[in-house]
């Protein structure tokens, strides 16, 4: 006879799974806020900065109250992948001025990567349909100047901050419905 069957797979508690994802998201939100403040202190921002390659804010996609878990997780994962790519690009091409934001920018990248893996795990544990692999994104053009790199950093950290807030609010709201 073959080996004895393993213990039955315990179905995960979705509230606990969501909890640990919210914790990571909140932690990353605090890191992002701190880094954005650091950037503002060193290079004060004049008004809003935008970067066309960044995802449009998820919160404009509709009222939070109408969201469903698969939609939130899929959208959040896609947006965070884009931000991860932008943070990597910033570290690589942002110029010497942004070197003053190391090692914090590197830590942010690592935590962003960790949250993405956590979201992937959450989606598989909750048996949500996995999104298709992302098509390769066109490379981001290097900033036109040192100031261009700084403006891009303001846009990336500001957008990430708002996206993470949307995520925390959406996930906690969904948790109340489980």
């Amino acid at each position: 006879p073959g080996p004895p069957p393993g213990p039955p797979r315990v179905s995960p508690d979705p509230r606990a799974e969501l909890d640990s994802t919210v914790l990571l998201t909140r932690s990353l939100l605090a890191d992002t806020r701190q880094l954005a403040a650091q950037l503002r202190d060193k290079f004060p921002a004049d008004g809003d900065h935008n970067l066309d390659s960044l995802p449009t804010l998820a919160m404009s996609a509709g009222a939070l109250g109408a969201l469903q878990l698969p939609g939130v997780l899929t959208r959040l994962r896609a947006d965070l992948l884009s931000y991860l790519r932008h943070v990597q690009w910033l570290r690589r091409a942002g110029g010497s001025s942004l070197k003053t934001l190391e090692p914090e920018l590197g830590t942010l990248q690592a935590r962003l990567d960790r949250l993405l893996r956590r979201l992937q795990l959450l989606m598989s544990r909750l048996a949500l349909p996995q999104p298709p692999p992302d098509p390769p994104a066109p490379p981001l053009a290097p900033p036109s100047s040192a100031w261009g790199g700084i403006r891009a950093a303001h846009a990336i950290l500001g957008g990430l901050h708002l996206t993470l807030d949307w995520a925390v609010r959406g996930l906690l709201l969904l948790k109340t419905r489980l």
Epitope: D19, L23, A63, L64, H161, L162
Partner: antibody, heavy 119, light 111 residues
């Protein structure tokens, strides 16, 4: 100086609606959420809901869903809370408060708006 | 919803004394090193004022005689040496889940 200035006291009849404004100054309006808190006489403080001025839907305490409506006018750095179908138990002081994104602690408060519901 | 219970309901002390205010949550409001409890002070006719956020962080402009501690379900606000202006009502609030809720308050009175 960071400030939230609310509209004046209101007296309303049962069944009516009230809309309170909250004008923010001294900080970047879109960097924080705007939360609303109720303080009825002899009752504990109650969170009504919040809104991110950058856009998207507000979120509400289930107890107030359907009766409270939170909106913002980003260009005027002003938040609004409308409460409909008023009843006597809505008599309270209503505060707007600046909320830290993702953490729901409130580091700046408006002076409060007293709403009295009486026939 | 998470229920916060504060004790005592009122406390009479003299200036210079140490005040210890307690807040107990109906379930844990801590996760992996973060405790989502915040403390406010409110004086009659005024709005609440943030004193402590995330259990132990002193809010901007708050004197160092105020401190917060605790984790899990039990939290404490300590005022090391009471000043005249500290006599007020104190509220704890959690933000572990939605909706955030407040305790019923502890009234600190002059003896």
């Amino acid at each position: 100086e960071v400030q939230l200035v609310q509209s004046g006291a209101e007296v309303k009849k049962p069944g009516a609606s009230v809309k309170i404004s909250c004008k923010a100054s001294g900080y970047t309006f879109t960097d924080y959420n705007m939360d609303w808190v109720k303080q009825a006489p002899g009752q504990r403080l109650e969170w009504i809901g919040d809104i991110n001025p950058h856009g998207g839907g507000p979120i509400y305490n289930q107890k107030f869903t359907g009766r409270a409506t939170l909106t913002v006018d980003k260009s005027a750095s002003t938040a609004y809370m409308e409460l409909s179908s008023l009843r006597s138990e809505d008599t309270a002081v209503y505060y707007c408060a600046r909320g830290e994104l993702g953490h729901w602690y409130f580091d700046v408060w408006g002076q409060g708006t007293t709403v009295t519901v009486s026939s | 919803d998470i229920v916060l219970t504060q004790s005592p309901a009122s406390l009479a002390l003299s200036p210079g004394e140490r005040a210890t205010l307690s807040c107990r949550a109906s379930k844990s409001v801590s996760t992996s090193g973060y405790s989502y409890i915040h403390w406010y002070q409110q004086k009659p006719g005024q709005a609440p004022r943030l004193l402590i956020y995330l259990a132990s962080n002193l809010a901007s402009g708050v004197p160092a005689r105020f401190s917060g501690s605790g984790s899990g379900t039990d939290f404490t606000l300590t005022i090391s040496s009471l000043e005249e202006e500290d006599f007020a009502t104190y509220y704890c609030q959690h933000s572990r889940d939605l909706p955030p809720t407040f305790g019923q308050g502890t009234k600190l009175e002059i003896k």
